[in-house]
């Protein structure tokens, strides 16, 4: 359906709040450099612009798509060179061109200060004195650092901010009434990044056909009631979405997640009967629940998949006929009978389906050459199974701090080169599984815990994308996405490293260390670990863990002292000494 | 949708030859191993002979082993079948069907009668 002005049309449908909310979302996460104030005055200016154009749609440049409006202010910024370098170079170029070229300078670890939160008083007075700006600015300096995040949901997420405010800042306890929800906010936002971070990268990086497979496994999953050509619909509707979210198009993407959660709720009876509560929320809440809503019970006796894709003789008249559907077809059928696989298995199983039909549909006695290809999907089913199985009860035995100590060891062994800090980051990421997925019952681990992985090693690979070091991370990251995870499994110790020269200055610590807080300290110890692995990559985890509980030791000992610095720079010394001499430095 | 096309059918006497052809569309008929199938009145559909897709591999059912031969030609997407020393038993419809699948074509009549 043309409009005349694409502005005014979603002026109109998203309303003016929104609108404001998702162009300051895609002004920032374009420009991640440039200041707050900077950001909402060329919001204001679009906005009085839009205002124009739905009082007439005819007014001058209304007729211009939403690119060229947004990219020709954008361009006006004044420090554009200064501040980004060849990014300025955009804007000599058309659209779509100059679109592509502010995509490709998106940063994914942007050089920008930690968020500090403020005492709760100040942030209480500030909501108070301008509660707009204050919510503006949440908006503002998460979108910056995550220039990925699904907006439509960031309007979520500064709902529930702003509903906490509101009812904390009159609470007796403030702090208690507000710290544990902006910590859940804080913990739920990184999560929520990180997964809208895989699905853009599965776009951009394999194409809209490997979303789409992605997505029927997991649609399937949740709606196992639903028809094929439903959950067909539903792919198709979902992969422009996230399409236009992932390409910056933030007004199309909230706009269309609007028409399918109107779409599901109006048809839930041929999808699911868990969306009655998800449909009774006003918009945003609808929209994250839906998202989020478990999955449906599968119907009772579905037939054997051997019959349709095994047995027929049809088999490759039906591969023929529509490739991708036929696939779509096995994808659907193969996903809503297994809740309890990861949608990351699915995929493999299908991939694994389509290479032996390609391979048999050719032979003169394709059946003979097929008959045994669900044979071939028990190893590629067992491997997560016991990968999982042994992790948990690794998991179990260590704790979550001393798991991820374990995978630190193991993956700065897999790739050294990789900087400290992702290292750390990733690793306490992984770890992370422990308490996220080993807590399930069997059927629901696998899921849990493979999913959640491909997140996080997503950020691996969107990390070292920005300065590659180690090819084995490009290899892995690149060669298949749904085989990363067994990828990354699968590397040993990389011999061709040669250990980092020994720095004192990388293992001297200072009192500071005493007034972090507990998970801070924690990364401190775990980027020393990295460090020695760096320095000494064939340690055993004897000699690791002897060193480690040294420093725990030392660092207890010195914050307990009098005179913490001198402790640490005495004991410190001592400490060096030792490990040097217990890893044979 | 697959489109197959059969040809080539006719009356032929005991002993004559006849030549088939299939035209394949809608389909990438190169990677896709092939089949002839006959159904004669009154009974079951019987599979006749099979290609691979590169045409290193042809079956034959024992029927017609030595009288007919597969081939086909991946540039036109054509499957061929050559019949020779025909029998009034050879008498069916014949079809092209993908893999050893079941017919959706119209396939040819073959009448071999004196």
């Known amino acids: 359906d043309a409009h005349k002005s694409e502005v005014a049309h979603r002026f109109k449908d998203l309303g003016e709040e929104n609108f404001k909310a998702l162009v300051l979302i895609a002004f920032a996460q374009y420009l991640q450099q440039c200041p707050f104030e900077d950001h909402v005055k060329l919001v204001n200016e679009v906005t009085e612009f839009a205002k124009t154009c739905v009082a007439d749609e005819s007014a001058e440049n209304c007729d211009k798509s939403l690119h060229t409006l947004f990219g020709d202010k954008l361009c006006t910024v004044a420090t554009l060179r200064e501040t980004y370098g060849e990014m300025a170079d955009c804007c000599a170029k058309q659209e779509p061109e100059r679109n592509e070229c502010f995509l490709q300078h998106k940063d994914d670890n942007p050089n920008l200060p930690r968020l500090v939160r403020p005492e709760v008083d100040v942030m209480c007075t500030a909501f108070h004195d301008n509660e707009e700006t204050f919510l503006k600015k949440y908006l503002y300096e998460i979108a910056r650092r995550h220039p990925y995040f699904y907006a439509p949901e960031l309007l979520f997420f500064a709902k529930r901010y702003k509903a906490a405010f509101t009812e904390c800042c009159q609470a007796a306890d403030k702090a208690a009434c507000l710290l544990p929800k902006l910590d859940e906010l804080r913990d739920e936002g990184k999560a929520s990044s990180a997964k809208q971070r895989l699905k853009c990268a599965s776009l951009q990086k394999f194409g809209e056909r490997a979303f789409k497979a992605w997505a029927v496994a997991r649609l399937s999953q949740r709606f196992p009631k639903a028809e094929f050509a439903e959950v067909s619909k539903l792919v198709t509707d979902l992969t422009k979405v996230h399409t236009e979210c992932c390409h910056g198009d933030l007004l199309e993407c909230a706009d269309d997640r609007a028409d399918l959660a109107k779409y599901i709720c109006e048809n839930q009876d041929s999808i699911s009967s868990k969306l009655k509560e998800c449909c009774e929320k006003p918009l945003l809440e609808k929209s994250h629940c839906i998202a989020e809503v478990e999955n449906d019970e599968m119907p009772a006796d579905l037939p054997s998949l051997a019959a349709d894709f095994v047995e027929s003789k049809d088999v490759c008249k039906n591969y023929a006929e529509a490739k991708d559907v036929f696939l779509g077809m096995f994808l659907y059928e193969y996903a809503r009978r297994h809740p309890d696989y990861s949608v990351v298995l699915l995929l493999r199983l299908a991939k694994t389906y389509e290479t032996t039909l390609e391979k048999c549909c050719a032979a003169a006695d394709p059946h003979e050459c097929y008959a045994k290809v669900f044979d071939e999907f028990k190893p590629l089913v067992e491997e997560p199974q016991n990968l999982i199985k042994q992790n948990c009860e690794l998991f179990e035995q260590l704790g979550e701090y001393k798991f991820q100590n374990a995978l630190l060891v193991r993956y700065t062994k897999k790739v050294p080169q990789v900087s400290t800090p992702t290292l750390v980051e990733v690793s306490r990421n992984l770890g992370k599984v422990g308490s996220k997925c080993c807590k399930h019952p069997e059927a629901k681990r696998m899921p849990c815990a493979e999913d959640y992985l491909s997140v996080v090693l997503n950020q691996l690979c969107v990390l070292h994308e920005k300065t590659p070091v180690s090819d084995r991370v490009t290899k892995c990251c690149t060669e298949s996405l749904v085989n990363r995870r067994p990828c990354f499994s699968a590397l040993e110790v990389d011999e061709t490293y040669v250990p980092k020269e020994f720095n004192a200055e990388t293992f001297t610590f200072h009192a500071d260390i005493c007034t972090l807080s507990e998970k801070e300290r924690q990364i401190k110890k775990q980027t020393a670990l990295v460090e020695l692995v760096k320095h000494k990559p064939k340690a055993t985890k004897e000699q690791l863990k002897a060193v480690m509980d040294d420093f725990a030791a030392f660092v207890e000992k010195c914050c307990k002292a009098d005179d913490k610095e001198t402790c640490f720079a005495e004991e410190g010394k001592k400490l060096v000494a030792a490990s040097q001499a217990a890893l044979g430095l | 949708a697959v489109q197959l096309v059969e040809s080539g059918g006719g009356l032929v006497q005991p002993g004559g030859s006849l030549r088939l052809t299939c035209t394949a569309s809608?389909?990438?008929?190169?990677?896709?191993?092939m089949s002839w199938v006959r159904q004669a009145p009154g009974k079951d559909q019987e599979w006749v002979s099979a290609?691979?897709?590169?045409?290193?591999?042809?079956n034959y059912a024992d029927s017609v082993k030595g009288r007919f031969t597969i081939s086909r030609d991946n540039a036109k997407k054509m499957l061929y079948l050559e019949m020779n020393s025909l029998k009034p038993e050879d008498t069916a419809v014949y079809y092209c069907?993908?893999?050893?699948?079941?017919?959706s074509s119209p396939g040819t009549q073959v009448t071999v009668s004196s």
């Open positions: 069907v993908i893999g050893r699948g079941s017919p």
């Open positions: 290609i691979s897709a590169d045409s290193s591999t042809k």
């Open positions: 809608q389909f990438t008929f190169r990677s896709f191993g």
